[in-house]
């Protein structure tokens, strides 16, 4: 057992341009408070567990009123440490979330209004009993400076707070098999204290307060013999006497979850699903009210003024679960339109838009036909972040403003000469060719190959293409 301690040194604008506006004003004075949430492990899986190591809420800071025209300074902080007690071993690696909250003290209907100013998170390695570790984290334009440490509560010692120490019974040495406690050389390592009532014959423990059963025994205190008549859920080795599998000690044996919690095995241990009103690793913390701050990740707690009435957590977008402990992947909804890239920053959703699109969700097609006219009778064709004009005959260019030179593409075949005409172009064909584009050779006998020359038009005469 022990305590994780967090000391906030400062919360204010970070370095660089774009200093944030002060969160408080003369019209709306406010004060800050902080919330810390701890989870065991460095892995991403730790994010799924609801502050399994514990959470704490600071006191409210002094009331602050912005000086008109002044930039946001470092804001006044609450006194004292944030302390998160842990009952079991300190994991050595942990994840943290520190939230900075603003409490507005204006004329609020129904009491003060709370809003989340900043949230920082990180994953760290930390040995219990070590010195204070200093850290700086940035959230948008804000900067949070803080220190933290984990310390064991006597009689626990060690980097994980799992070794127990007792004062020496004799001044010279410790008892048989027990070492001196470093750094407290005047104390001796004590044997592990198992859960009260744990059978000394059939139970054992690897951590204080635990009671794990030897093969053939079950129950919370390992006092119940396992029935050999029905060999359900085989787990352990075969029993020589019955020739049947006897369940060995599984993590959910004897249901470690208190207060009606249901136990489910996980690859490494077990997980308790607690009924409303209870929480903690084993549902051992009871009588939860809104004053205990049971809603994580900025959830708003409603009701639960006394331990008998249930509280309800209203989760902010991006979180769900009875305590707002589960993160929703908002980017899985693909909120960024038109091929935009989604970034879930936790406190906000951001879209990085493709060229040609803008807006919070890339919903604004900058190159569409809206408000864009195609000149000279052209029509606008839009789509996919680009627009183009389909121009009327004789016009070209992006907006159909340029007069097209119909002869630019050299449309007259076989050496025919091209003339621009108000209704298009005219080809004057070289001897031996005819057609609108001089595409047909004239046969020596005067007959043309497909199609026949129009009446009154001799081969070689200019032909107008309409």
């Amino acid at each position: 057992a022990g305590v994780f301690e967090l000391q906030i040194h400062s919360f204010g604008p970070g370095p660089g341009p774009g200093a944030p506006r002060s969160p408080c004003s003369a019209r709306l004075p406010c004060r800050l408070f902080f919330r810390v949430c701890l989870k065991p492990g460095l892995s991403e899986e730790a994010a799924e567990s609801p502050c399994a190591l514990g959470a704490a809420l600071s006191a409210r800071g002094p009331v602050y009123t912005e000086q008109p025209g002044a930039p946001a300074p470092d804001l006044p902080l609450p006194d004292g440490l944030l302390q998160v007690p842990f009952r079991d071993a300190w994991p050595g690696t942990f994840s943290f979330i520190i939230e900075t909250w603003r409490e507005e003290l204006g004329d609020q209907i129904g009491g003060p209004a709370w809003s989340l100013l900043a949230r920082v998170a990180g994953r760290r390695r930390l040995a219990a009993g070590g010195p204070w570790a200093r850290d700086i984290q940035r959230a948008g334009a804000w900067e949070l400076r803080f220190s933290y440490r984990a310390r064991c509560e006597p009689p626990a010692v060690g980097t994980a707070c799992t070794r127990l120490c007792r004062p020496r019974s004799a001044p010279s040495r410790c008892g048989p098999g027990l070492r001196p406690c470093a750094p407290l050389e005047d104390e001796c390592e004590a044997p592990l204290v198992c859960r009260a009532g744990c059978s000394p014959e059939h139970g054992f423990c690897e951590q204080p307060g635990e009671c794990r059963c030897l093969e053939g025994w079950t129950g919370p205190l390992c006092t119940v013999p396992v029935s050999t008549s029905s060999c359900l859920s085989p787990r352990g080795p075969s029993s020589a006497t019955t020739g049947c599998l006897v369940p060995g000690p599984g993590p959910c044996d004897g249901n470690p979850c208190a207060n009606g919690g249901s136990c489910s095995e996980t690859p490494r241990s077990f997980e308790c699903t607690c009924p409303r009103g209870f929480y903690g690793l084993r549902c051992e913390v009871s009588g939860v009210t809104c004053a205990d701050g049971p809603c994580f990740n900025g959830g708003l707690c409603v009701g639960g003024a006394d331990p008998d009435s249930a509280y309800i957590c209203h989760c902010p977008p991006g979180f769900q679960g009875s305590n707002c402990e589960k993160r929703v992947d908002r980017c899985s909804l693909q909120p960024c339109r038109n091929g935009g890239l989604c970034l879930d920053l936790g406190h906000a959703l951001r879209c990085r838009c493709r060229a040609g699109f803008a807006g919070p969700r890339c919903e604004h097609d900058l190159d569409d036909c809206a408000g864009r006219a195609c000149a000279n009778g052209g029509t606008c064709v839009e789509g996919g972040g680009a627009h183009r004009c389909s121009c009327a005959l004789g016009f070209g260019g992006r907006d159909c403003r340029e007069r097209a030179d119909p002869c630019a593409a050299r449309p007259c075949a076989h050496g025919g000469r091209c003339y621009a005409h108000f209704s298009g172009l005219v080809c004057a064909c070289a001897p031996g060719y005819m057609g609108a584009r001089c595409e047909f050779p004239v046969h020596p006998d005067g007959a043309s190959a497909l199609p026949a020359a129009p009446p009154g038009l001799r081969p070689g005469d200019p032909q107008r293409y309409l």
């Epitope: 209004a113 908002r330 909804l333 339109r337 038109n338 969700r361």
Partner: antibody, heavy 121, light 107 residues
Framework: EVQLVESGGGLVQPGGSLRLSCAAS????????IHWVRQAPGKGLEWVAY????????YYADTVKGRFTISRDNAKNSLYLQMNSLRAEDTAVYYC??????????????WGQGTTVTVSS | DIQMTQSPSSLSASVGDRVTITCRAS??????LNWYQQKPGGAVKLLIY???RLHSGVPSRFSGSGSGTDYTLTISSLQPEDFATYYC?????????FGGGTKVEIK
Amino acid sequence: EVQLVESGGGLVQPGGSLRLSCAASGFTFSDYGIHWVRQAPGKGLEWVAYISSGGYTIYYADTVKGRFTISRDNAKNSLYLQMNSLRAEDTAVYYCARGDYDDIFYTMDYWGQGTTVTVSS
Amino acid sequence: DIQMTQSPSSLSASVGDRVTITCRASRDITKFLNWYQQKPGGAVKLLIYYTSRLHSGVPSRFSGSGSGTDYTLTISSLQPEDFATYYCQQGNTLPWTFGGGTKVEIK
């Protein structure tokens, strides 16, 4: 309970001006974008304008761009639509509607009852 | 602008009938399609958002489906309070546009 109440409608001559208001309650107004949507007599719904929760993003339909101005006062939980150079085709019932949190879907999840604007000489 | 074409423009049905309304967009709207109900008094309610997600408090007899340009609103068993006009709206690209509406009348 989420509530949106529009006001400020009335009869106005072509070329005249009108200012519509929308009073919001039952939710944290400053967390949500708000839309104005209108419905001409016997016709369907037409989106008019949108303003984001902090007022930094503003959009208008082409039919009203340059004539209408959307604004909000988060301290008063109020939304406004300033309508200038009004035309006969602006005659409609005007609704304010709340957008979804985070503008993921660009829905209009709660609507007011509407206020009637008649432009006629 | 993205045009939204709703069909049919009106339909007559009886209580208990299964009713289907379709909405076609002039280009892909990537499921950002919402459905609204408007009662004769003028009140408008969101029924379904993001093609198929039921808004809170909306009965489960309403459902939505579709993708790309084609979307459908289905009322599995029409109730007396469902006689109203239904509109689709795309939330993909500005300006937000509505379909012309489908009036569901009593047969």
